[in-house]
Interface confidence: low
């Protein structure tokens, strides 16, 4: 059952995995979320009845039975992960913790002019888990305005103590504000040679480069597959770091693959999310149960619905035995991931999709797309909204993208003549325009927020966000799309689709059912060769065939120019501007969404 | 190990410029800060500034800031101090050093160079 309350003045009695440091019992039930064992904590409040060594302790629980046996004490502050939960989870911790020094490694010192410059330095270095700055008012001189950068080997402060003058706070990297670049490469055939910080076994290089990703020391790794000659490391998983954050030497070894961690792009990727499942393969562990079940997928479901379960293995049913059940072994482990990884024994193997609700909705694997054809499938643009007017009649006026359970991102040069978001409706999973009757359910518009710069759309900052007055519940035909991630400027898309109901020419009408087609992205100098009369800026992108014949037209405007990558689909572009319809050389200009990602989190999660 | 070897001192008017340069060979990927620091006769050691050789983060001392400016050169493994509008407190010995702190702590840096002297006469 999911309790997110907290408990004053509780302290749950005995079931200790560990103790860490945290500055407040809320960061603490985050520690304890994305702990693999934890399921309850007890946290210790600063307070003069308490002894000050003890506080801000949080003691990481876990229980059989999912509880423990509640005791009364001061200052202690009581909870439950929300791993029992099935709303989302964020790790994103932007609060400053004032007075408080929270104490690691200081392997950065430098002056900074305020505490929110000191956290963007955190954000951007590659080793920094938390700062503290001691502010102008500091007591001794040679100190003031001096930022430090920490880190530890958990990603939480070894201890946190009362200092006057100074503030804390932790990187922001988990709410995918950092501008350090991500290099999404898996590189096949090479070890990495540098110090490992921890060891873990994993499945394939993919699960390998996830678990690097959230574990807070690991820079990059190496994975050994299965024929790598030294049996005893076949699929071990080696998470490593350098000081520099980059490997310093890369060997050439068959059968091993590296990469790095994503921790700065973690926001598009799947990072806790193991769906695949694993034939002929056994993964070991501590067994929490064994039951019957008719597949490896009813398995996994079983396994997700046991919140202590990690992982399991499933053996399928011999002919005719116990109703053409197999056995489904549900397992855990002290982090996670099986103990040993056995192959050849006729297993099928697979993880917990309970930690799914961890990564970000956008990163979930949507229905495979039809290929060919303009008309679109229901589900096959799950984030693709249509934006009608009520005034004078009703009617559909732009497209826009699903960005958030509040959020739909469009393009500004829609507002035109919108007096008040009164007269809007969104509408969400609609694949016919024909769908929307008297009845149809819409989501009212609070708010519209268009760009402050924003003049027309040929001078860019054609952006717009809404903020929906009721939040969507996301399902396989309305949930969100990734925004891509600033360290990922250096991505080529090359699997692009620009989808809306505009029209298919020139002079035409708004169409019934949503379309679809794939464009190539195009250069910027290529594009600014093609409209010699504007200025092509680094914020917008273009997108079309040389020799026309597909683009966005009339009414796509403020749809997504949507591409894939690594599986992932991105909003890259929202549909803006061109010269006509799909001509000649006269490619769509859309706005370059990558340039606008802080300006759409600075708006989206304003307090 | 690490070698650095500075370059580019000598004697100068008040108001003058000079560019120091620190080339550095060895292990050198294990750095993760180079600074300058200098010693002026009968003085401590002095942090001048700080560079963060793979974030590029840097700082500088009150005392340089506006006039010094601190860069790097990755493809010649080089550190630079350009030194603008010199005073004649700027009289000192100038240390390259390499560490993986980004510290003005002398005891941070666990490479450094042999010195080039910086005279400013007024």
């Known amino acids: 059952e999911c309790v997110t309350q907290l408990l004053k003045d509780t302290c749950f009695e005995g079931g200790d995995i560990t103790t860490v440091f945290t500055p407040s019992a809320k960061y603490c039930q985050v520690v304890c979320t994305y702990h693999p064992r934890c399921l309850l904590f007890t946290f210790t409040a600063e307070s003069p009845s308490e002894d000050p060594t003890r506080w801000f302790t949080c003691v990481l629980k876990d229980s059989v039975t999912e509880t423990l046996p509640r005791v009364n004490r001061t200052a202690a502050i009581s909870g439950y992960s929300f791993k029992q939960c099935s709303h989302q989870i964020s790790a994103c911790n932007k609060d400053i913790y004032v007075d408080l020094d929270m104490k690691g490694i200081n392997y950065n010192s430098s002056v900074a002019k305020s505490a929110q410059e000191c956290q963007e330095r955190c954000t951007d270095d590659v080793h920094c888990h938390f700062f503290t700055y001691a502010t102008r008012q500091f007591p001794s001189l040679e100190h003031r305005n001096i930022c430090l950068l920490k880190h530890t080997q958990t990603g939480t402060p070894t201890r946190i103590t009362k200092l006057d003058k100074v503030v804390s706070g932790f990187s922001l990297k988990s709410c995918a504000l950092s501008n350090l670049a991500c290099i999404r490469d898996i590189f096949p055939n090479t070890v990495f040679a540098d110090s490992n910080i921890d060891s873990v076994m994993a499945p394939d290089a993919f699960v390998c480069g996830r678990i690097c990703t959230h574990h807070p020391g690991c820079l990059f790794f190496t994975f050994f597959s299965q024929e790598w000659p030294k049996e005893s490391q076949r699929n071990l998983c080696l998470l490593k770091t350098s000081e520099s954050g980059l490997p310093s030497t890369r060997i050439k070894k068959s059968k091993a693959l590296s990469g790095f961690s994503l921790q700065s792009c973690r926001h598009s990727i799947p990072v806790f999310c193991h769906s695949s499942f694993y034939h002929d393969t056994d993964f070991l562990g501590e067994e929490l149960d064994i039951v019957a079940a008719k597949s490896h997928e009813a398995c996994q479901k079983l396994c997700t619905n046991a919140v202590r379960c990690q992982f399991f293995t499933y053996t399928p049913a011999q002919a005719s035995c116990n109703e053409g059940k197999g056995k489904c072994y549900l397992k855990l482990s002290s982090n996670g991931s099986p103990t040993k990884i056995l192959h050849g024994r006729g297993g099928i193997s697979g993880y917990t999709l309970r930690l799914c609700k961890m990564d970000n909705e956008c990163t979930t694997k949507i229905k495979p797309r039809i290929v060919g054809g303009t008309a679109s499938v229901r589900g096959e643009w799950p984030w693709q909204v249509t934006l009608h007017t009520t005034s004078p009649t009703q009617r559909h006026l732009c497209g826009g993208s699903i960005i958030g359970n509040q959020w739909i991102l469009t393009a500004a040069h829609c507002f035109y003549g919108v007096e008040s978001p009164k007269i809007l409706r969104v509408y969400s999973g609609i694949l016919n325009q024909s769908e929307i009757k008297e009845d149809t359910s819409f989501f009212g518009v609070q708010e519209i927020i268009i760009h402050d710069q924003y003049k027309m759309a040929e001078s860019g900052y054609d952006i717009a966000l809404l903020k929906l007055e009721t939040t969507v519940n996301y399902t396989d035909s309305q949930r969100p799309i990734c925004l891509p991630s600033k360290g990922d400027r250096n991505v080529i898309y090359t699997d692009c689709w620009v989808t809306g109901w505009g029209y298919r020419k020139l002079r035409d009408k708004i169409q019934n059912t949503l379309q679809k087609a794939k464009i190539p992205l195009v250069t910027n100098e290529e594009c600014q060769k093609r409209y010699r009369g504007h200025k092509i800026t680094h914020k917008m992108i273009c997108a079309g065939y040389r020799e026309g014949g597909k683009d966005a037209c009339k009414g796509d405007s403020g749809g997504p120019l949507s591409c894939k990558h690594n599986e992932v689909w991105h909003l890259v572009g929202i549909t803006s501007w061109g010269e006509g319809c799909a001509q000649r050389e006269r490619p769509g200009v859309y706005t370059n969404v990558v340039e606008y990602v802080d300006w759409i989190l600075e708006k989206t999660q304003a307090v | 190990q690490v070698q650095l070897v500075e370059s580019g001192g000598g004697s100068v008017q008040a108001g003058g410029s000079l560019r120091l340069s620190c080339a550095a060979s060895g292990y050198t990927y294990s750095m993760g800060a180079m600074a300058w620091f200098r010693q002026a006769p009968g003085k401590g050691l002095e942090g001048v500034s700080l560079?963060?050789?793979?974030?590029?983060?840097?700082s500088y001392t009150d005392s340089v800031k506006g006039r010094f400016t601190i860069s790097q050169d990755n493809s010649k493994n080089t550190l630079y101090l350009q030194m603008n509008s010199l005073k004649p407190e700027d009289t000192a010995v100038y240390y390259c050093?390499?560490?993986?702190?980004?510290?003005?702590?002398?005891?941070?840096?666990?490479?450094w160079g042999q010195g080039t002297l910086v005279t400013v006469s007024s």
């Open positions: 560079i963060a050789t793979s974030s590029g983060f840097i």
């Open positions: 050093a390499a560490g993986t702190q980004f510290s003005w702590s002398p005891g941070s840096y666990n490479y």
